[in-house]
Interface confidence: low
């Protein structure tokens, strides 16, 4: 059986986020009347027992007993990374190493490349970049709640030689459903501890108009007032509405925004009505067939695409 060396100090490796605080704890079972000491990767003594050896206000004594020496380093910088040594000056000197790893926090991503006023079926290409991560972060894309598959994250070393800049691009064909959608680039990194660090770009998609005719009331009778609403959609929203009646001289006069009004419905109003909604992206005509019967029956109506 190997006998345990009770005078051998022990410690542990630590990981800390840049700007955070790390505690280095060194313990020993049998101190043999000797003091514990902490030194940094440059072999500068930080504390010998409870005595401060290095003038750095970031380094504070947490605990000093014959069996333990604990110190804290606040506002940790990337330059603080490395092997810290705990020593006890017995015969012979015994040491324990603590590897301190400093994580670089990725900056909020920046999205570039957005081209405004995309038209339906054009391809949008966006670029995302985040600097300052260590180790290199990962970038992910999404459109609303839907994941987008960008290209593989590219990694480039920052000028400081310690952190990394990561970048990724995504391309997709836009549809009218994408108008007003938020394209989000998120950075994933262990230093964030699950917190969301993302940037979004709202996109605008121009698309041709569509229209639909809606009667008000839904079931008008002879003698009633009827409004035929022409409801246009599109980006830009249709600004011009023209009503025609098949077999009549065009156009009919609108009296209320995009609606056609019948103050007093007659059987002679029966027929097929067309509403053309126009924007600078194009035109769309919706049709509505109105059958005006006696005061009791319900008119049959339909609307057709052209």
């Amino acid at each position: 059986n190997l006998s345990q060396d009770d005078s051998q100090p022990w410690t542990s490796d630590e990981t800390v986020v840049a700007g955070g605080t790390v505690v280095l704890k060194c313990q020993v079972k049998d101190h043999e009347d000797s003091s514990l000491q902490w030194s940094n990767p440059a072999q500068q003594t930080l504390y010998f027992g409870e005595k401060r050896a290095l003038r750095d206000n970031r380094i504070q004594l947490v605990s000093s007993t014959p069996h333990e020496l604990s110190i804290s380093i606040s506002n940790v910088a990337l330059a603080d990374e490395g092997e810290y040594t705990c020593s006890i000056f017995t015969m012979p000197v015994r040491t324990a190493k603590s590897l301190v790893t400093v994580l670089g926090i990725p900056q909020k991503p920046i999205i570039t490349g957005y081209k405004s006023s995309l038209r339906e079926k054009e391809t949008a290409t966006l670029n995302c970049q985040s600097s300052g991560s260590k180790p290199a972060a990962q970038l992910t894309w999404r459109k609303g709640d839907q994941e987008l598959h960008g290209d593989q994250t590219r990694i480039q070393e920052d000028p400081n030689g310690k952190t990394f800049t990561v970048s990724s691009s995504v391309s997709f064909q836009v549809t009218r459903e994408d108008d007003g959608a938020n394209i989000v680039c998120s950075v994933n990194h262990e230093s964030l501890k699950g917190a969301d660090r993302s940037t979004s770009q709202r996109i605008e998609v121009l698309y041709t108009p569509t229209a639909m005719i809606r009667p008000e009331p839904a079931h008008p009778r002879e003698g009633q007032k009827l409004l035929l609403h022409c409801e246009g959609r599109g980006n830009p929203v249709p600004q011009q509405y023209v009503w025609v009646k098949e077999g009549s001289e065009p156009p009919l006069k609108m009296t209320q925004e995009s609606a056609l009004i019948f103050p007093f419905l007659n059987k002679s109003d029966s027929g097929t009505y067309g509403c053309t909604a126009t924007s600078n992206m194009g035109s769309y005509t919706a049709y509505f067939t109105l059958n005006v019967n006696d005061p009791s029956p319900v008119p049959s109506s339909s609307s057709t695409y052209h």
């Epitope: 009218r176 639909m212 319900v298 049959s300 109506s301 339909s302 609307s303």
Partner: nanobody, 124 residues
């Protein structure tokens, strides 16, 4: 849990007929519009027909006009699509959809609830 279940699809010869049904559960759909869309292999989903909450107003795509008829039976919470004079280009998965408002809509973004679809194959 909102559910739309389509049925009635299948294999039919050109010139034949099919009647698709769309049954709704999980919400009172009788007060809402309903639409049929279809998606052929390798193509985008396209509008076929829509019907308003009362059944008084219907809309058809050009490709469906004169051949397809949309109707509804609110007592059964069901909407139908009667398809006549079917052609090979009508082959697609047909989807039933319902919006979260009364107003019928003519493109997919106006609909919030979708069925799983039923396959219609027109072939000799």
């Amino acid at each position: 849990q909102v559910q739309l279940v389509e049925s009635g699809g299948g294999l039919v010869q050109p010139g034949g007929s099919l009647r698709l049904s769309c049954a709704a559960s999980g919400r009172t759909f009788s007060n809402y519009a309903r639409g049929w869309f279809r998606q052929a292999p390798g193509k985008e989903r396209e509008f076929v027909a829509a019907i308003d909450y009362s059944g008084g107003s219907t809309n058809y795509a050009d490709s469906a006009k004169g051949r397809f008829t949309i109707s509804r039976d609110n007592s059964k919470n069901t909407v139908y699509l009667q398809m006549n004079s079917l052609r090979a280009e009508d082959t697609a998965v047909y989807y039933c959809a319902a919006p979260a408002s009364r107003r019928p809509s003519w493109d997919a973004d106006g609909y919030d609830y979708w069925g799983q679809g039923t396959l219609v194959t027109v072939s000799s």
